[in-house]
């Protein structure tokens, strides 16, 4: 039998993520929820204890005993600034036991207090099984990452965390150093190169610089800040959108917890969203008092909203190089982690830092520090794998899957172009009070309504309990695997009963022919499908506009280079146009159109005078004239409670 | 002083096509947009849609898509309306009105008569 | 579409008297943000060219005399003539700017 694999675990202070090197290249391992990342979260309840989604799911009504951040804990004494600072932030109690922190809750009826070791071993264990249920036989072996600023103390904790979890800790090694792995920076051959790990992520940011020459790796300089990141861009949204429902309904839902985790788990959907589309759209029914809220945002007005955190991210940048006795010029390789680097403002306002330097980002950012890892893991092991750095060129699907919803509106799962195999999940609901059962009937193709695309097959989910409509939630999954088999799966999260169908290429699927086809309608359709998408670019066009301009203006670097009247024409004519928007969200296309011209009559002359001459264009990526139209929206993000 | 002079009244023949033109001076034309506003014989105005002077993208009111053209020459720093298909309800006084914060200095007005 | 009512359709005052015109709109032109009303009054003497007069409901045009003044918040709006001279008959205009735009019927103003 082949030798056991060894794998590579990220173990993040808000998720984890694990790997393994098979078959020539890595993999990156999927939990039982389908997500390639796990929460580094652990809760008790009465009856028993969760880890991963399950325990994140949860925290909000069992916030005392769900336990995250045991990074921030680990290796670190309880009188430690750092402890007793975070502490304050903590919904769950840190006790002191000999200046050792523990973690305390009530478990089965009980009150018990737990190391942050264990606390991590519990995660790490977790890793360990979803390696093993994907690899099917037990692991022992593995390397775990830690940030590259970790003192000795941190790191053995966290070796003895691996140990606690049943693993052979073949090596603890940097984050940093991992995500460098991973892009082959270490064997480019070229000498002695200077690498830059730009991490952001869910709670964390970190700047490394490292030195990589022959193979050895050396750090040079770290800096960053503990407490930035995701949840930091999330918080900005829930608080923009508590506003709004401010506004829009004069009713203030920031102390409903229930409230404020449905629009928050809505709110990171969002951004994420935001990182490929420049608009992501909130459908939360009820969220409050029975109010629905739908809405929407654009990507500019995040950035708006988080523009001094983005900002923020240069500074340890630039304490990094001075650590490293650097200059910017002397780096030779960018390389983004942590999925926040997914943010293209981030990743511009990182790029232009750096004069335009390709950023090393073909890796999912958040899986890069476990790809390295799982590729220092098979060294490790003796793996003489020649193609240690090749990736797997995968397949997509050629066309958008989903299933109808209420109005015969076709609900896209997986969008068209995804690569495969993939797998999400979405929840549903019922139409109608007490309705016995749900009709699923996938699809694929692009257009709005499902009577315009190509049914692929149906089945019936019976037996679901008498409740009113929207009470019930069926969840729903598509899997396709990498033959491209489709496995659609419904399931009552109330009995657990689930119905499945499995679609194969050969059964009810189009050729390509009938694929080309069906795209060509697609475009043919357009303009049926996109009165209200037109609609949506409308107001997105004009509100990228507005924030871009306002922006613009306010940039340190045109002090002086323009008038303070034309400075506030710019930002009053902005302030106007962007309160508008927040009370005529609903404005039909003429209405956005008429406004963006007007800022554009207002704020162009004023901004081309800026910039001609000064050989490029305009802020924002565009001429004087300023962008035309605008993209369509972005995707729908639906509800999840 | 600013100032915008418009062409002398003009009589068609319905069907035809009339070009109206409204010549700023006395400030930067690009900076400030153009309006086109309609007062029938002892009615009230009408506001047609008016032309970003700087990019020359108009906007037209739903009554006056179709027919009507705006169009800027920045050279000269004129503007134009120009309707064809001319019919006798077209009959009017076509005024241009600069925007700044409302619409602060208009042309004296352009008669156009519209008779078989 | 913002549809503009003025009231009343003539109005006839003596010299030396006050005039007011209203005009009611359809919905709100007030912009939270910048705090301000988008409501401008224009008047046309017989055979002339539209006149700016006020906007942002208050706010007076330069060179406008102070006997007019604009108020209002929302959807009501004034112009008030404090004391009428002959040279202010006219027909008064209001027109909103909130979005789009579009003027008000129109309001005439004569000597009694």
């Known amino acids: 039998m082949a030798k056991a694999a060894a794998i590579g675990i990220d173990l993040g202070t808000t998720y984890s993520c694990v790997g393994v090197f098979q078959h020539g290249k890595v993999e990156i391992i999927a939990n039982d929820q389908g997500n390639r990342t796990t929460p580094s979260y652990v809760a008790f309840t009465d009856t028993e204890r969760l880890i991963g989604d399950a325990a994140k799911n949860q925290v909000a009504l069992n916030p005392q005993n769900t336990v995250f951040d045991a990074k921030r804990l680990i290796g670190r004494k309880f009188g430690d600034p750092v402890v007793q600072s975070d502490m304050k932030h903590w919904p769950f109690q840190v006790i002191n036991d000999g200046d050792k922190p523990k973690v305390q809750v009530s478990y089965k009826g009980e009150t018990k207090a737990f190391y942050p070791e264990e606390i991590s071993s519990m995660v790490l264990t977790k890793m360990k099984e979803i390696a093993e249920a994907y690899l099917g036989y037990p692991v022992t072996n593995a390397v775990i990452t830690v940030p590259a600023y970790f003192n000795d103390s941190q790191r053995q904790a966290t070796k003895d965390a691996g140990v606690i979890a049943g693993l052979n800790v073949l090596r603890i090694i940097n984050e940093p150093t991992a995500a460098a792995i991973a892009y082959g920076l270490d064997r480019t051959g070229k000498g002695e190169r200077n690498v830059l790990i730009f991490d952001l992520g869910g709670g964390t940011f970190d700047v490394s610089i490292l030195t990589i020459d022959d193979g050895i790796f050396e750090v040079k300089a770290t800096a960053g800040d503990t407490h930035l990141g995701g949840e930091d861009f999330d918080n900005r949204l829930v608080n923009h959108f508590v506003e709004e429902f401010k506004r829009k309904h004069k009713k203030d839902i920031s102390q409903n917890k229930r409230a404020v985790r449905r629009l928050r788990t809505a709110c990171e959907r969002a951004k994420r969203t935001l990182s490929s589309s420049t608009q992501a759209s909130l459908e939360i029914d009820s969220l409050f008092e029975g109010i629905d809220f739908y809405t929407s945002i654009t990507r500019a007005r995040f950035e708006e909203l988080c523009s001094d955190l983005f900002r923020s991210t240069l500074e340890p940048v630039e304490k990094a190089l001075r650590d490293a006795k650097l200059d910017k010029a002397q780096i030779h390789d960018l390389v983004l982690v942590g999925g926040s680097t997914r943010i293209p403002k981030v990743q511009k306002l990182l790029q232009d830092f750096f004069n335009g330097r390709d950023l090393n980002k073909s890796i999912n950012p958040d899986e890069a520090v476990a790809y390295g890892a799982a590729v220092q893991a098979a060294i490790l092991m003796g793996d003489k794998s020649e193609n240690v750095q090749d990736l797997l060129l995968l397949d997509v699907a050629p066309l958008s899957l989903g299933l109808e919803t209420a109005g015969g509106v076709m609900t896209a799962l997986i969008k068209r172009n995804s690569t495969i195999p993939t797998k999400q999940t979405q929840i549903f609901t019922t139409y109608s009070d007490n309705q016995p059962g749900v009709l699923i009937q996938v699809y694929e193709g692009e257009r709005a309504m499902t009577k315009d695309n190509n049914l692929l097959g149906r089945f019936e989910l019976s037996g679901i309990p008498p409740a009113p409509r929207g009470v019930p939630q069926i969840e729903v999954t598509f899997d396709i695997d990498a033959n491209g088999i489709l496995n659609v799966t419904a399931t009552d999260k109330s009995t657990g009963k689930a119905n499945k169908i499995t679609i194969t290429n050969d059964k009810g699927r189009l050729s390509k022919e009938e694929i080309e086809r069906m795209v060509q309608e697609a475009e043919k359709y357009k303009a049926e499908d996109e009165v209200q998408r037109e609609r949506v670019s409308a107001k997105n066009a004009l509100e990228s506009y507005a924030f871009n301009m306002k922006s613009a203006v306010e940039d340190e670097g045109l002090k002086g280079k323009i008038s303070e009247a034309d400075k506030k024409k710019v930002l009053d004519k902005c302030q106007e146009v962007i309160s508008w928007l927040d009370a005529n969200t609903l404005a039909e296309k003429d209405e956005f159109e008429h406004k963006r011209k007007e800022l554009e009559q207002v704020c162009n002359p004023i901004i081309s005078g800026l910039y001609q001459g000064a050989g490029g264009p305009g802020p924002g990526g565009f001429g004087a004239q300023g962008p035309k139209g605008g993209s369509g929206s972005g995707p729908t993000i639906e509800e999840v409670d | 002083q600013i100032q915008l002079v418009q062409s002398g009244a003009e009589v068609k023949k319905p069907g035809a096509s009339v070009k109206v033109s409204c010549k700023a001076s006395g400030y930067t034309f690009t900076n400030y947009g153009m309006n086109w506003v309609r007062q029938a014989p002892g009615q009230g105005l009408e506001w047609m849609g008016w032309i970003n002077t700087y990019t020359g993208e108009p906007t037209y009111t739903d009554d006056f898509k179709g027919r009507f053209t705006f169009t800027t020459d920045t050279s000269t720093s004129t503007a134009y309306m120009e309707l064809r298909s001319l019919r006798s309800d077209d009959t009017a006084v076509y005024f241009c009105?600069?925007?700044?914060?409302?619409?602060?200095?208009w042309g004296q007005g352009t008669l156009v008569t519209v008779s078989s | 579409e913002i549809v503009l009512t003025q009231s009343p359709d003539s109005l006839a005052v003596s010299l030396g008297e006050r005039a007011t015109i209203n005009c009611k709109s359809s919905q709100s032109l007030l912009n939270s943000g910048t705090r301000k009303n988008y409501l401008a009054w224009y008047q046309q003497k017989a055979g002339q060219s539209p006149k700016l007069l006020i906007y942002?409901?208050?706010t007076r045009e330069s060179g406008v005399p102070d006997r007019f003044s604009g108020s209002g918040s929302g959807t009501d709006f004034t112009l008030t003539i404090d004391s009428l001279q002959a040279e202010d008959v006219a027909v008064y205009y209001c027109k909103q700017s909130y979005t789009l735009y579009t003027f008000g019927g129109g309001t005439k103003v004569e000597i009694k």
């Open positions: 942002w409901t208050s």
């Open positions: 009105a600069r925007y700044d914060h409302a619409m602060d200095y």
